[in-house]
């Protein structure tokens, strides 16, 4: 870590040191310690306050980002008198050296990539590191696979995502043998970056007077199940005039996924495709393959 | 359509076991996650415990921690609940279900019911 | 004693409009985890109802709906029926704790 931390204290010093690699704050306990609390202030004065037993001498900050720069303090009243110390966490590094544009998705339910660009104010020689700790085990992951832009890690491909929990925290180190290079981090949702592959085995069924689409709910890296999914169905009238509205229709996900709709014979060539979203989201896979039904002279 | 059968209703003795099935018919088993929930006049539902995709493994309650064994049979599409140590307080019926989703934990699609009844 | 605080029993008139409360407290409602719905028929097994807050399985008709606000939640039922008579029971999940809670059941009569 190339963050400078600045203690601010009173003379008889609680020694307050953080860890970032464990969001761990802690202090010198003090004996006849009557209550203590920690908590940090960031650059947009929002104020984070972690669970505090009051004989701990630690706290433990679970999701927070720390490259725009915070303050952390550290209040603790014994029997005899109260202790007060702040510790600068600043980002430390050139200004605009970090980098920038950072975003991650998931897809084909179980590869990840991530992607960030570099800082406009860092040198020819930076080069970026990607960092991923869970929120369960606090087990760092390594980038294994950099994706590289003149020799500049500039992304990064996962093929082993079982180390990840339902929020993760990443964080992007720099460096230079010119100058310092700032960090950049950020907390993700896994159910908010994954992008699902379409349904699978889509299939239409027609008698005289219907047809049933059924589907099959794509294979995810989150667990999902059901009632989590919700699907959009294109059914389009081929050879129609351009221009011509689809019809477009919602469907909940159900145990068994089906649509049944009336369509009478003698019917005209029609295909059908399918999509699908997490249904609190609702950010879109891309279409399944058009299945055609129907004949061309119905 | 996909249907939960539970077995038939028991009646046993304090100290005793019980073991209640739940058939799946219209679905592989292996495909869904079923959770057991029981509900008593006095204390409502209470959930039991059920499998856990995260975890890959059945997750239980910690009230019924060490009394309560759920397994499942995928080759007959059968889950199975075992109480044992039976007190009169477990007097309730019992229900399979299928969950509908994971979070938070909802349970989409109940089986009947199956009436436990403990006395002496 | 139930983790999710519903009234024992409401009324209404066919045709009429009733809503059921279903209060929690930040460790679960309000954490924020979402609130799902059941309906029990009396002498049956419980049916979901809503689910995710708001949203309705299929074949839930649209005379149910649903809300959540902070930490309390509730189920509106409109245009009362004769068939709606029965228990209605809320649920989430509580944090640190696995599995569902559930609310005490609310009995909805039709006067």
């Known amino acids: 870590e190339k963050s400078d931390l600045r203690t601010v204290a009173p003379a008889s010093s609680l020694n307050v040191r953080f860890d970032s690699r464990t969001m761990n704050l802690s202090w010198d306990c003090q004996e006849n310690t009557t209550f203590s609390k920690c908590f940090l202030t960031d650059k947009k004065n929002r104020v984070v306050e972690p669970r505090l037993s009051n004989n701990e001498c630690s706290c433990t900050f679970r999701e927070i980002c720390l490259h725009e720069g915070v303050t952390f303090e550290v209040h603790v009243n014994t029997s005899q008198r109260g202790f007060q110390q702040k510790l600068l966490y600043p980002n430390s590094g050139r200004e605009g050296t970090a980098a920038q544009n950072f975003s991650c998705f998931i897809y084909n339910a179980d590869l990840m990539n991530c992607t960030w660009a570099r800082g406009p104010t860092a040198p020819r020689d930076v080069q970026y590191f990607l960092y991923i700790r869970n929120s369960k085990r606090r087990r760092e992951i390594r980038c294994p696979y950099y994706i590289q832009d003149s020799g500049t890690h500039v992304g990064c491909h996962l093929d082993n995502l079982s180390g990840l929990t339902s929020r993760n925290y990443f964080l992007v180190n720099g460096t230079s043998r010119e100058i310092g290079i700032q960090f950049f981090d950020s907390l993700l949702d896994t159910k908010k970056i994954e992008r699902f592959n379409p349904p699978s085995n889509v299939t239409v069924r027609c008698n005289t007077t219907h047809c049933l689409v059924r589907w099959k709910q794509p294979r995810t890296y989150q667990k999902l199940s059901y009632l989590d999914f919700q699907y959009q169905l294109d059914v389009h009238r081929k050879n129609t005039q351009p221009g011509t509205e689809n019809l477009l229709i919602n469907v909940s996900g159900d145990l068994e996924n089906r649509y049944n709709f009336p369509s009478s014979e003698p019917r005209a060539k029609h295909s059908v495709k399918i999509r699908a979203a997490d249904v609190r989201i609702l950010n879109w896979s891309s279409w399944s393959e058009a299945i055609e039904f129907g004949s061309d002279d119905g | 359509q996909v249907q939960l059968v539970q077995s038939g209703a028991e009646v046993k003795k304090p100290g005793a076991s019980v073991k209640v099935s739940c058939k799946i018919s219209?679905?592989?088993?292996?495909?869904?996650?079923i959770h057991w929930v029981r509900q008593t006049p006095t204390k409502g539902f209470e959930w039991m415990g059920g499998f856990d995709p995260e975890e890959n493994e059945i997750v239980y309650a910690q009230r019924f921690q060490g009394r309560v064994t759920m397994t499942e049979d995928t080759s007959i599409d059968t889950a199975y609940l075992t109480l044992s140590s039976l007190r009169s307080d477990d007097t309730a019926v019992y229900y399979c279900?299928?969950?509908?989703?994971?979070?938070?934990?909802?349970?989409?699609?109940w089986g009947k019911g199956t009436m436990v009844t403990v006395s002496s | 004693q139930a983790v999710l605080t519903q009234p024992s029993s409401v009324s209404g008139a066919p045709g009429q409009r009733v809503t059921i409360s279903c209060t929690g407290s930040?460790?679960?409602?309000?954490?924020?985890?979402?609130v799902s719905w059941y309906q029990q028929l009396p002498g049956t097994a419980p049916k979901l109802l809503i689910y995710?807050?708001?949203k309705r399985p299929s074949g839930v008709p649209d005379r149910f709906s649903a809300s959540k606000s902070g930490t309390s939640a509730s189920l509106a039922i409109t245009g009362l029926q004769a068939d709606d008579e029965a228990d209605y029971y809320c649920?989430?999940?509580?944090?640190?704790?696995?599995?569902?809670?559930f609310g005490g059941g609310t009995k909805v009569t039709v006067l």
């Open positions: 219209g679905h592989s088993l292996s495909e869904l996650s």
């Open positions: 995710h807050n708001n």
């Open positions: 930040g460790s679960n409602i309000g954490a924020p985890y979402d």
């Open positions: 649920a989430t999940v509580e944090d640190g704790l696995s599995g569902s809670v």
């Open positions: 279900s299928i969950v509908g989703s994971f979070s938070p934990l909802t349970m989409g699609l």
